[in-house]
Interface confidence: low
Amino acid sequence: HTAAQDNCTCPTNKMTVCSPDGPGGRCQCRALGSGMAVDCSTLTSKCLLLKARMSAPKNARTLVRPSEHALVDNDGLYDPDCDPEGRFKARQCNQTSVCWCVNSVGVRRTDKGDLSLRCDELVRTHHILIDLRHRPTAGAFNHSDLDAELRRLFRERYRLHPKFVAAVHYEQPTIQIELRQNTSQKAAGDVDIGDAAYYFERDIKGESLFQGRGGLDLRVRGEPLQVERTLIYYLDEIPPKFSMKRLT
C-alpha cells in the first residue's frame, strides 16, 4: 500500500520523505538532504531543516537593546554539518576548506579560518530576541492582547513551553519577543527556542515548514498582524570570539 493511503506524512516538516517502513509498518519520515529519521510529533531541528533546504532545487524605552555580544545571522544560508541528533556541529566548513565555529542555532560566532580551526564545544544560544515591525494599522494593538496572542502562538503552533517566552515588548510599530532557555532549564521533550524561532521566522516570511497547514494567519482581536520586517538577535551562554577588525 502507498504512503498516501496511510496518510503517511510529517505534519511538522514538509521537507521530508515518508513511507510506512518503520517498525510494524509504521510511518517513518526522513529529512531531505540528510536522510535522518525525524520525530514528526515535534519541530525538526534547524540544522536538519537548513540541510534539507540546501538540498532542495534552487529556486526604544521598553524595547530591549541587544547587547554588544548579540549575533545576527548575516551569513545567510549554508549547507551545515549536523550531528547524529540533528544538532549543529560546533565546527562548520565549506567546500573550499574555510571553517568557522557556530552556536546552537547555527550562527557563526568566530572569524573564519582554515581546517586547523578548533571549536571545542557547541555553545548554546540561551536568549533570542525577535524584533518585528508591523505594517501600519488603524491604531496600536492592545499590548496585553498582543502578548497573549504571541504566547498562544508559540505554545500551540510551535509547542514551546510558555516559560521560555520571557517577554513580549511593544512600542508601535515594533514588537519584540524574548525567548530564554538555559541548558539547565531544557528538559527532555522540550522544544528548543532556536528551532521555534526558526519555524516562526519561516512562517513570517510565508514559507511555512508545516505540512498542509495554511500560512500563518496572525490576528489580535480579529485585526490582522502583518509583519513587514524581521530581525533576530542571538545571545550565547559564552560571548562570541571575533577579532577587533570585525567589530569596528
Epitope: 505534519p11 510511518c27 514528526c40 510529533s41 515535534t42 513551553h161 510558555p162 528538559a187 527532555a188 521533550g189
Partner: antibody, heavy 121, light 107 residues
C-alpha cells in the same frame, strides 16, 4: 474545534473484556499523546496509561499491567482502551484525554465525554 | 509512586470569596502540576498547567503557584459557576497521579 468523542456506555459481566474507542478531530492526531483516566462512582481520578500516537508506543500504570491494552489507529485518528478480566471494581467512567509527549506536557487539555462501563453479573 | 495530597477535602464558601486549595506532593515534582475543575456528570476541565500557567480561555480569577512539593490553586473572587470539585495532578513522571479532590460548595 478540537474534540474527542468516545463510544457509548457498556454493560459487561465479570471476567469479560471491554474496548472503548476515542475518536479525535480538529487537530493532527499524531502530534499529541492520548491518555486514559477512569473515575469510579463518587471517587477521584485514576490514571491508567497513555499512548504516544506518533510512535505507537503505550505505557501503562502498574495497577493495570497485563489487563489493559492501549492502541491507536492513525488512519482513523482513533485511540482505544481495552480492559480484560473485568471485576465489579472496574465499574467506572473511562475518559480519554489529549496530552503532549514529554513530561512537561503530560497535562490533559482536551477530554472525551466519558464512557460508563458497568460490570455486573 | 508520587502521592498528591489535597486539602481541604471539602470547603464551603460564598460568591465573592477568595478561596485557596493546596496540594502537597510526596516528592519534588518541580513545577509539573496541573489543576482541573469537574462538575457533576461532566469531564474535568484543565485550568492551570506547569503550576502557574493558565490554560486558554480560563478566567483570570484562577491562578496557580508553587514548586517542589507545595502547590496552591487560588480563586480570587468566587463566581456561582465555580462551585465544583477541583483536582491537582502531577505531570512530572509516570505513573501520573491526582489528588483526591476538593469539593467546593456554596455556603
Amino acid at each position: 474545534q478540537v474534540q474527542l468523542v468516545q463510544s457509548g456506555a457498556e454493560v459487561k459481566k465479570p471476567g469479560a473484556s471491554v474496548k472503548v474507542s476515542c475518536k479525535a478531530s480538529g487537530y493532527t492526531f499524531t502530534t499529541a499523546g492520548m491518555q486514559w483516566v477512569r473515575q469510579a462512582p463518587g471517587q477521584g481520578l485514576e490514571w491508567m496509561g497513555w499512548i504516544n500516537t506518533h510512535s505507537g508506543v503505550p505505557k501503562y500504570a502498574e495497577d493495570f499491567h497485563g489487563r489493559v491494552t492501549i492502541s491507536a489507529d492513525t488512519s482513523t485518528s482513533t485511540a482505544y482502551l481495552q480492559l480484560s478480566s473485568l471485576k465489579s471494581e472496574d465499574t467506572a467512567v473511562y475518559y480519554c484525554a489529549r496530552s503532549g509527549f514529554g513530561s512537561s506536557y503530560w497535562y490533559f487539555d482536551v477530554w472525551g465525554q466519558g464512557t460508563l462501563v458497568t460490570v455486573s453479573s | 509512586d508520587i502521592q498528591m495530597t489535597q486539602s481541604p477535602s471539602s470547603l464551603s464558601a460564598s460568591v465573592g470569596d477568595r478561596v485557596t486549595i493546596t496540594c502537597k506532593a510526596s516528592q519534588d515534582v518541580s513545577t509539573a502540576v496541573a489543576w482541573y475543575q469537574q462538575k457533576p456528570g461532566k469531564a474535568p476541565k484543565l485550568l492551570i498547567y506547569s503550576a502557574s500557567y493558565r490554560y486558554t480561555g480560563v478566567p483570570s480569577r484562577f491562578s496557580g503557584s508553587g514548586s517542589g512539593t507545595d502547590f496552591t490553586l487560588t480563586i480570587s473572587s468566587l463566581q456561582p459557576e465555580d462551585f465544583a470539585v477541583y483536582y491537582c495532578q502531577q505531570h512530572y513522571i509516570t505513573p501520573l497521579t491526582f489528588g483526591q479532590g476538593t469539593k467546593l460548595e456554596i455556603k
